[in-house]
């Protein structure tokens, strides 16, 4: 498991002649915002595939009004980065669609109205635990510069964050009330499935579903801090060189979720997971019912029959939790066989299976493909006697010698218009959803498919 | 070179039937974004009728006016139909074909013509 | 849905300039899915504005168009004896369904 994370650094014309001046105007302020997709970039699926690593939608940037006369500015962004957290190993090769989109804030009838300025794609090499790499892509006479990474959660390391690292000795090791000591490589083993919320920073398991503390952490997920003793003990300051660290103040300290919420700690910050009932970054929001869309991920809302639970989520397979907002984890039962990479498509289970192996599992053993050729950059496979071509973009048939047909699936969502393009496919939205494949729906109360998505597009226009 | 040529226009009686014909040279729908149908009557301005799309999905497009008399249908990688029914004077016209691009976040840009082929309705 | 186009027809000396108005009873898709054509007696039209204001490709960068949500403007600076034709503004909408509408056309006449 690990995080992908995207920091926008500008957006705005590129250099040239006929670049635009703004994608705002005095007549029409509006404000911008991103979305990213990530897909693993072997994969053999089509370019219509869904954000099988991912998708993530930024905040919206500051109100810009363009000044008329005046030089064309940086336009201003959305803070923070992008973060989209993976579940999986990481891939190593992954493609991204980044979106830029932007909100128009002036007087429209049915709020404000949003609009695709600009799409970027392209395909990457990256490990893992690496430094920031920087990138600069064009769309049309728009250039977009960003930076971006993909690190581990802890406690998965390695360049594809397929290795669980835990420090076997590390409660003997520390003192009480002290943090672990860095794991070193050859206290790394194979993954154990520890009971579901257990903190991967104060607890561990031996055997699967079972949660235990590290000395100076306590409570069933080992979330609760005992004391905050330091490394300078009776015997004198000589245990600070043990290799030990002292805690600061945690994000947890003072337990900063609201109503009942219990606190764990990210590498980052803190994360709260709230009672049925409440939501919010602190658990902070309440009274929700069904009318406030709390399930995500295309669960079914029912209401509650007693006041504290006024609402009921019914999730859609693949996903769990009271909103429905974890994805369940089917990936930790190995079924990939032959060293197949497991992806949880939400729907259904995939695996990527290594050179040499092919079907649903990875179960079978492939011959060389003896030299035969495919055409426009596609790769062979050979099984049971019979070659295949496992085509590149944009190309099918038998040795990928046809033009393929990106738009026959029907890929774009609620009445979207597909259209064959150089990068594969696009789709044009219809008013009131948005994404590469029109699959969210922006509501116009702000509730939406995605907890971060933005409020409605302009509902669309009569046709007379 | 990229070309449009339609087909199959002449004299109908009102009430009548008839299919034009487009045909594409220099490059195949599947790989372009949706082909249309336009009309002008003489003297009059341009009026758009419906669009299918280019790959193999066969999604259409129409206006409200056309639904029900006027059928678009793409018969080959290179040809498209329009056919009309209960055709009366009003649809006496020059009918297009045009291909319909995505640029920029925008559709329906029609950025090749055919040179058009007249429909009288006449008795 | 209707596209209203003024004036029609309009005319105007060689270098001179004209203004034509597009005006939409309501937003285009995305506020900015309009586009013009040139259309000469005997001729199909001719894409030369996308998205409201972008130039399609081989047009002159005197044809200029303008305007966002429901009105817009095509501007023809320093005109060209090979600029009279008819001119229309087509308008792209969603209601169930996506549908394309044209304006009636403004001939433009070149003294």
């Known amino acids: 498991a690990g995080v992908f994370e995207l920091q926008i650094h500008s957006f705005g014309p590129g250099p040239g002649p006929g670049a635009p001046r703004s994608p705002c105007s005095a007549r029409l302020p509006c404000r911008l915002f991103f979305r990213v997709c990530l897909k693993p970039g072997l994969s053999e699926e089509a370019a219509e595939s869904p954000c099988a690593l991912g998708a993530a939608l930024s905040a919206r940037g500051p109100v810009y009004t363009e000044q008329p006369g005046a030089p064309a500015p940086d336009l201003p962004l959305p803070d923070g980065l992008l973060q989209v957290p993976f579940r999986d190993a990481w891939p190593g090769t992954f493609s991204f669609i980044i979106e830029t989109w932007r909100e128009e804030l002036g007087d429209q009838i049915g709020g404000p109205a949003w609009s695709l300025l600009a799409r970027v794609a392209g395909r990457r090499r990256l490990a893992a635990g690496g430094p920031w790499a920087r990138d600069i892509q064009r769309a049309g006479a728009w250039e977009l510069r960003f930076s971006y990474r993909a690190r581990c959660e802890p406690p998965a390391v390695g360049t594809a964050c397929t290795r669980l690292c835990r420090p076997r000795s590390a409660p003997s090791r520390c003192g009480p009330g002290l943090r672990p000591c860095a794991p070193l490589e050859d206290e790394c083993e194979a993954p154990l499935v520890c009971r579901a919320g257990c903190s991967p920073e104060h607890g561990f398991c031996e055997q699967p579903g079972e949660c235990r503390c590290l000395e100076g952490w306590t409570g069933p997920l080992c979330t609760v801090p005992v004391s905050t003793s330091s490394c300078l003990s009776p015997r004198g300051p000589s245990s600070a060189t043990t290799g030990c660290l002292v805690p600061g103040p945690g994000p947890c300290d003072g337990n900063p979720c609201a109503n009942g919420g219990s606190c764990s700690e990210t590498p980052r910050s803190f994360e709260c997971t709230c009672p049925r009932g409440f939501y919010g970054l602190r658990c902070e929001v309440s009274g929700v019912t069904c009318a406030d869309g709390p399930c995500f991920n295309g669960g079914l809302c029912v209401g509650g029959a007693d006041p504290d639970s006024a609402y009921i989520c019914h999730c859609p397979p693949g996903f769990q939790g009271s909103n429905c907002e974890k994805r369940v984890d089917r990936c930790s039962l190995q079924p990939c066989r032959n060293g197949g990479l497991c992806l949880d498509l939400g729907h259904a289970l995939r695996c990527r299976c290594r050179a040499g192996f092919a079907g649903p599992r990875c179960e079978h053993d492939l011959d060389d493909c003896a030299g035969r050729a495919c055409a426009n950059g596609g790769t062979c496979v050979e099984g049971g006697g019979a070659h295949r071509c496992s085509c590149a973009l944009g190309f099918g048939g038998r040795d990928c010698r046809e033009r393929a047909d990106p738009c026959a699936a029907r890929p774009c969502a609620h009445g979207g218009r597909c259209y064959a393009h150089f990068s594969g496919l696009v789709c044009a939205c219809a008013p009131g959803y948005m994404g590469a494949r029109c699959e969210f729906p922006v509501h116009p109360d702000g509730a939406s498919a995605l907890p971060a998505a933005p409020p409605g597009l302009r509902p669309g226009d009569p046709q007379r | 070179q990229e070309q449009l040529v339609e087909s199959g226009g002449g004299l109908v009686q009102p009430e009548g039937s008839l299919t034009l014909t487009c045909t594409a040279s220099?490059?195949?729908?599947?790989?372009?974004?949706?082909m249309c149908w336009v009309r002008q009557a003489p003297g009059k301005g341009l009026e758009w009728i419906a669009c299918?799309?280019?790959?193999?999905?066969?999604?259409t497009d129409y206006a409200n006016w056309a639904k029900g008399r006027f059928s678009i249908s793409k018969t080959s990688s290179t040809t498209v139909t329009l056919q009309m029914t209960s055709l009366t004077v009003a649809d006496t016209a020059t009918y297009f074909c045009?291909?319909?691009?995505?640029?920029?976040?925008?559709?329906?840009?029609?950025?090749?013509w055919g040179p058009g082929t007249l429909v009288t309705v006449s008795s | 849905q209707v596209l209203t186009q003024t004036p029609s027809p309009v005319s105007a000396a060689v270098g001179g300039t004209v203004t034509i108005s597009c005006q939409a009873s309501?937003?285009?898709?995305?506020?900015?899915?309009l586009a013009w054509y040139q259309q000469k007696p005997g001729q199909p039209p001719k894409l030369l504005i996308y998205?409201?204001?972008s130039l399609a490709s081989g047009v002159p960068s005197r044809f200029k168009g303008s305007g966002a949500g429901t009105q817009f403007t095509l501007t023809i600076s320093d005109l060209e004896c090979d600029d009279a034709a008819t001119y229309y503004c087509?308008?792209?909408?969603?209601?169930?369904?996506?549908?394309?509408?044209f304006g009636g056309g403004t001939e433009v006449v070149v003294k």
């Open positions: 045009a291909r319909d691009v995505y640029i920029d976040s925008t559709i329906f840009n029609f950025n090749l």
């Open positions: 220099g490059f195949s729908f599947s790989s372009s974004g949706y």
């Open positions: 299918i799309s280019g790959g193999s999905s066969g999604d």
């Open positions: 309501q937003s285009v898709y995305n506020n900015n899915n």
């Open positions: 998205a409201a204001s």
């Open positions: 087509q308008g792209t909408y969603y209601s169930s369904g996506w549908y394309s509408t």
